[in-house]
Interface confidence: medium
């Protein structure tokens, strides 16, 4: 790669902080580590110094030059669970409706279905920032050394955590946004009209419900730390901006921040769902709720999380990313052959 | 399992008032269900006199607004009904029957559930 | 006050056969904003207290033969028995939930031929 030329010196390639976003467990130190945050991380930040020539750049490269690489793999499974959640929403509240009882529904779906299918996609590309992380620490426990190469698959997953996180990020802001202009809607004035009309014909003067209250106000106040949060792992993630934190105020906001934000975001829609997990009413055509699918993976990645935290195994993964190995799950011919 | 249970005098003498207690068992009236009074005089049919909502309010039948009153004792998870100047047209059977409460998607809900009825007859 | 009209009065329809119920509305008993109608389908039989059939003049109450069907919308609505069997034989009452005073129609009685 022609950046190469831009560092001479190798000493300067260890001084550079390699940029393995929204989440940073040192996954990455093992068998290669230390020679893997060289040959991938950094080559993204050297990148950066390799356009002085760029509007220069040969019409023959300009093809074979991919257009954003890191981001075809979050963007096509952002895209997938989109999909797949936007399909099965509308299946819930517009064919359901329509097939049962005659009603036409569609309206619902520029804002009610499409502000469903954002704050799925954007919980489960949370929870894909740090399942390959749960997933490493796994591996390295089972293999018992840190000098073993990860599947190419999960090698490629770390490498796009900064991407997922990203985009989980963009879906948040999105859900946020399209959540705000529920009461600018006609349809929500219309049916407000139409609910204070009802409260007049059963003499009701007062239509608080206590538990409805407080359920809103929490899930909407995690839902917006959770955002605020979010926010700040984004900004952090800016070159700029992470280039002026040392590795360890980078790793721990990255790290311990990002699981915070998960967290928020479950219990966002736990509280969301409140009362409703017992409600079969929910259950169209026998399907569970969108909330009931999205908070899944999340509380997967949670609790994994929060056994891997357990002192016991948090030690033995210190001891493994620190260079310690379980003799008794090493194949002493495979070391030999590695070195 | 829900029961609804209607009580109260089965003679009623003219210009008296009928009183009338449903007592719920299994549920409480308190929540989730609205309770109704509905009336059938012999051979004719079905009318609608007045409902309590889960809060305690109420509505009547214009047509017998002016004579009904409906009540609650929540200790007793019960609630009744109260009809002033009785005549003779007021004879009928006289049902209890719940609905889901008023939400805000779906507003109102059919009657799923009625007592077996109770013969009121208005007679000197 | 919403006048449920029913018609006919009464009905005679052999066993297996179907039968039909008609039910109008003085004035439409379909809220646009959520799409349904508050109409409802009872079932009464002689000494008994009337029992819920169908609700928001489509959805079968659980516990409801498929043999019975509602349809309809606005303001006019039919109760369909598919197969009519001897235990069908009741009077059958719509009533609307669109408005208070909840208001209930004529009824019709169905009586096997």
């Known amino acids: 790669m022609e950046s190469r030329k831009d560092i001479t010196n190798q000493e300067e390639l260890w001084k550079m902080k390699p940029r393995r976003n929204l989440e940073e467990d040192d996954y990455l130190h093992k068998d290669t580590g230390e020679t893997s945050m060289l040959k991938r991380p950094v080559l993204l930040h050297l990148h950066q110094t390799a356009h002085a020539d760029e509007f220069d750049c040969p019409s023959e490269l300009q093809h074979t030059q991919e257009l954003f690489p890191q981001w075809h793999l979050p963007i096509k499974i952002a895209a997938i669970i989109a999909s797949l959640t936007f399909l099965y929403t509308l299946l819930r509240e517009v064919i359901h409706p329509l097939a049962t009882s005659h009603q036409q529904y569609f309206y619902k779906i520029p804002i009610l279905v499409i502000n469903k299918v954002l704050p799925m996609v954007s919980i489960t590309l949370l929870a894909l920032v740090y399942l390959p992380g749960v997933i490493a620490a796994i591996v390295q426990l089972h293999n018992g050394t840190k000098y073993k190469k990860f599947p190419h698959w999960l090698d490629k997953w770390m490498l796009t955590r900064k991407q997922f996180g990203l985009l989980s990020f963009f879906f948040a802001v999105l859900h946020a946004i399209y959540s705000l202009s529920y009461p600018m809607r006609r349809s929500y004035r219309y049916k407000l009209l139409n609910w204070a009309y009802q409260q007049v014909q059963q003499n009701k003067e007062d239509a608080w419900i206590e538990h409805d209250v407080w359920r809103m106000e929490i899930y909407v106040s995690l839902g917006i730390v959770g955002l605020a949060i979010l926010a700040l792992l984004a900004v952090t993630s800016i070159p700029s901006v992470s280039d002026s934190l040392t590795w360890r105020e980078f790793h721990y906001i990255q790290s311990k921040l990002g699981i915070v934000s998960l967290l928020l975001g479950t219990i966002h829609a736990l509280i969301f769902a409140w009362n409703k997990w017992i409600d079969i009413k929910q259950f169209v055509w026998y399907t569970p709720p969108t909330f009931m699918i999205a908070v899944f993976l999340p509380i997967v990645v949670l609790i994994f999380k929060s056994i891997l935290f357990l002192p016991c195994l948090r030690k033995k993964i210190l001891k493994i990313r620190h260079g310690w190995e379980d003799v008794t799950k090493i194949n002493k011919t495979e070391i030999c052959s590695q070195l | 399992q829900v029961q609804v249970q209607e009580s109260g005098p089965g003679l009623v003498k003219p210009s008296q008032t009928l009183s009338l207690t449903c007592t719920v068992s299994?549920?409480?009236?308190?929540?989730?269900?609205?309770w109704n009074w509905i009336r059938q005089p012999p051979g004719k049919k079905l009318e609608w006199i007045g409902y309590?909502?889960?809060?305690?309010?109420?509505v009547y039948n214009p047509s017998l607004k002016s004579r009904v009153t409906i009540s609650r004792d929540t200790s007793k998870n019960q609630f009744s009904l109260k009809l002033s100047s009785v005549t003779a047209a007021d004879t009928a059977v006289y049902y209890c029957?719940?609905?889901?409460?008023?939400?805000?998607?779906?507003?109102?809900?059919?009657?799923?559930?009625w007592g077996q009825g109770t013969l009121v007859t208005v007679s000197s | 006050d919403i006048v449920m009209t029913q018609s006919p009065d009464s009905l005679a329809v052999s066993l297996g056969e179907r039968a039909t119920i008609n039910c109008k509305s003085s004035?439409?008993?379909?809220?646009?904003?959520?799409?349904?109608?508050?109409l409802a389908w009872y079932q009464q039989k002689p000494g008994q207290p009337p029992k819920l059939l169908i609700y928001?003049?489509?959805t079968r109450e659980s516990g409801v033969p498929d043999r019975f069907s509602g349809s309809g919308s606005g303001t006019d609505f039919t109760l369909t028995i598919s197969s009519l069997q001897a235990e069908d034989v009741a009077v059958y009452y719509c009533?609307?939930?669109?408005?208070?005073?909840?208001?209930f129609g004529g009824g019709t009685k169905v009586e096997i031929k």
């Open positions: 029957a719940r609905e889901r409460n008023y939400d805000y998607e779906l507003y109102y809900y059919a009657m799923d559930y």
């Open positions: 299994g549920y409480s009236i308190t929540s989730d269900y609205s």
């Open positions: 309590i909502g889960e809060s305690g309010s109420t």
């Open positions: 004035q439409t008993l379909l809220y646009r904003s959520n799409q349904k109608n508050y």
């Open positions: 928001w003049a489509y």
């Open positions: 009533q609307q939930y669109y408005k208070y005073p909840r208001t």
